[in-house]
């Protein structure tokens, strides 16, 4: 017996052959022995089957030989075995049809689960491989769960059902709702505009929700809400903003936050939250400011930075075109008795600049210049 | 993980320069800097500069400023260090760090360049 | 520059025994901003290039046997193997990096008594 393996909302075609390429009798019958379809000379007549709408056949195979049956719109219930009857023959043909469904929304927000459910008929036992986006392989029976999505999982996922050594394949599109990073940081000198984006990952025809971005700067005790905003079809409305510091929000997407200057009691750690309608969970967006500035007091040349650094990086004085002069893993540094001219102050990160600020020292009889 | 394989022994006269090569194999160089460490014959280490082989800056020990240049060849992941004005005292084996965190604890060792400075 | 100074100079153990190496900075290598001590220590046999055993002071570089300890804060720090093998015969190097330029010690010896 021949198997034939398909998909829910498919058409499938199941193929009958008589030895003699004319057009001859033919009939096909589930097997309950209801006729589904045949012919009459050259007209297709239907029998009283379930099917009865959604059977047809190829009248132009039939001086061939071939007396096909084409079931459309492939329900579970399709499954069964059929029998084609042509020249005292008869040919069985096994349909399984198979359905792939997403739990429940196959918009998903970063950090939830997927639940894939393999719809099946009775008495089969199918397995079920699916490979993600990015080439991870998850391997189940009725049910596949992926717990905590990431933003790769995003795409089509190909998964394959495999029974009686046939396979078909399924593909599913999951869009998975996040922002583009988890986390960024910014570097500033001390007085300079601070820019903060949060572009998101995916595109949707309305984005409508609503957000807030806490801060946690480093010399405060506790966090605050900076802003609240309102999203309407992609539209940026602020709600609420603290009059310190007074955070400007662009009105389009992507969210776009300005802080009008970088000053050492803002730097500190930002999370961002979005949540989007009709979904359950926020999406989430952490975001840094490292604030330093140079200051020259009396006889001494100071560099400082402000907010979350790693000990990777290092905070170096120079005199321009010249050697550290001092080069430590700390977040502030000092020369006494600095040399006039152009010193610079320098966070690195394995000789990589992130952030610069020029002092210019004049000869000891003046004051400090800052560029 | 990176491996570092280093140029073979040189022999140079006093006042000549070497210039020694360090090739990174296995994963290509993340943004960590590639320092530079010699040891004179039955002596301890001493740490002569780094670079960053991503963006190409350097940082050099005080002592030896003017005459250590550090260079690299991005298409073939190669970093070198050149040492001009050779004098006996330069006779040492010179090799090539990594630390694959970023601290500078190092982690990953080339096998070391023997470098003889002799009239 | 920061000196780093190792005693003693040489070290006779014998074998199973605990072995103590010493390691002072001129200045200390803790950072008061992150809270780290930026002190590593290395094994360095005949013909070899030096190997990681210690960073941050005290944490082990993975593979390293469990034998090894290092401890200290500030300016003073220890290398310890608490039963000396064979293998560990070597000669032992503490180095700083808070500050460049990075300082290694003199080197200490360790032979079988």
């Known amino acids: 017996k021949k198997v034939v393996l398909g998909k829910k909302g498919d058409t499938v075609e199941l193929t009958c052959t008589a030895s003699q390429k004319k057009s001859i009798q033919f009939h096909w019958k589930n097997s309950n022995q209801i006729k589904i379809l045949g012919n009459q000379g050259s007209f297709l007549t239907k029998g009283p089957s379930k099917l009865n709408d959604r059977a047809d056949s190829r009248r132009s195979l039939w001086d061939q030989g071939n007396f096909p049956l084409i079931i459309k719109n492939l329900k579970i219930e399709d499954s069964d075995t059929y029998i084609c009857e042509v020249e005292d023959q008869k040919e069985e043909v096994q349909l399984l049809v198979f359905g792939l469904t997403a739990n429940s929304d196959t918009h998903l927000l970063q950090g939830q689960s997927l639940t894939l459910t393999l719809e099946s008929p009775p008495g089969s036992s199918p397995s079920v491989q699916c490979r993600s986006p990015r080439g991870k392989n998850i391997q189940g029976g009725k049910t596949l769960s992926v717990s905590q999505l990431e933003l790769q999982d995003s795409g089509t996922w190909t998964c394959t059902v495999l029974q009686n050594q046939k396979k078909v394949e399924f593909k599913i599109d999951i869009v998975v709702l996040a922002f583009q990073k988890a986390s960024s940081i910014v570097y500033k000198k001390e007085g300079e505009q601070v820019e903060f984006s949060f572009p998101l990952a995916f595109t949707v025809e309305k984005l409508t929700g609503s957000g807030e971005l806490w801060w946690q700067a480093e010399r405060a005790s506790s966090s605050k809400s900076w802003i609240t905003f309102d999203l309407k079809n992609k539209e940026v409305s602020v709600k609420r903003v603290t009059q310190d510091p007074k955070l400007q929000m662009g009105k389009k997407l992507p969210l776009h936050l300005t802080l009008p200057q970088a000053l050492p009691q803002y730097a500190g750690s930002g999370n961002l939250t979005l949540a989007l309608e009709a979904k359950t969970g926020k999406l989430h967006q952490e975001v840094n400011l490292v604030v330093m500035r140079a200051t020259q007091l009396q006889k001494n040349l100071t560099c400082e930075v402000w907010g979350p650094t790693s000990p990777k990086l290092m905070l170096s004085l120079k005199l321009e075109n010249k050697e550290a002069k001092v080069s430590k893993r700390e977040k502030a540094v000092w020369v006494l008795n600095p040399e006039a001219g152009m010193w610079q102050c320098l966070l690195s990160d394995s000789g990589q600049v992130l952030l610069e600020s020029n002092i210019k020292v004049l000869p000891t009889w003046s004051t400090p210049v800052q560029p | 993980q990176v491996q570092l394989v280093q140029s073979g022994a040189e022999v140079k006269k006093p006042g000549a320069s070497v210039k020694v090569s360090c090739k990174a194999s296995?994963?290509?160089?993340?943004?960590?800097?590639i320092n530079w460490v010699r040891q004179a014959p039955g002596q301890g280490l001493e740490w002569m500069g780094w670079?960053?082989?991503?963006?190409?800056?350097?940082g050099y020990a005080q002592k030896f400023q003017g005459r250590v240049t550090m260079t690299r060849d991005t298409s073939t992941s190669t970093v070198y260090m050149e040492l001009s004005s050779l004098r006996s005292e330069d006779t040492a084996v010179y090799y090539c760090?990594?630390?694959?965190?970023?601290?500078?604890?190092?982690?990953?060792w080339g096998q070391g360049t023997t470098v003889t400075v002799s009239s | 520059d920061i000196v780093m100074t190792q005693s003693p100079d040489s070290l006779a153990v014998s074998l199973g025994e605990r072995a103590t190496i010493n390691c002072k900075s001129s200045?200390?290598?803790?950072?008061?901003?992150?809270?780290?001590?930026?002190l590593a220590w290395y094994q360095q046999k005949p013909g070899q290039p030096p190997k990681l055993l210690i960073y941050?002071?005290?944490t082990r570089q993975s593979g390293v046997p469990d034998r090894f300890s290092g401890s200290g804060s500030g300016t003073d720090f220890t290398l310890t193997i608490s039963s000396l093998q064979a293998e560990d015969v070597a000669v032992y190097y503490c180095?700083?990096?808070?500050?460049?330029?990075?300082?290694f010690g003199q080197g200490t010896k360790l032979e079988i008594k």
């Open positions: 760090v990594y630390d694959s965190s970023g601290y500078d604890a190092f982690d990953i």
């Open positions: 296995g994963d290509t160089f993340s943004d960590h800097a």
């Open positions: 670079m960053n082989p991503k963006i190409g800056n350097t």
């Open positions: 200045q200390s290598v803790l950072s008061t901003s992150y809270n780290r001590n930026f």
């Open positions: 941050w002071a005290s």
């Open positions: 180095q700083q990096y808070y500050s460049t330029p990075y300082t």
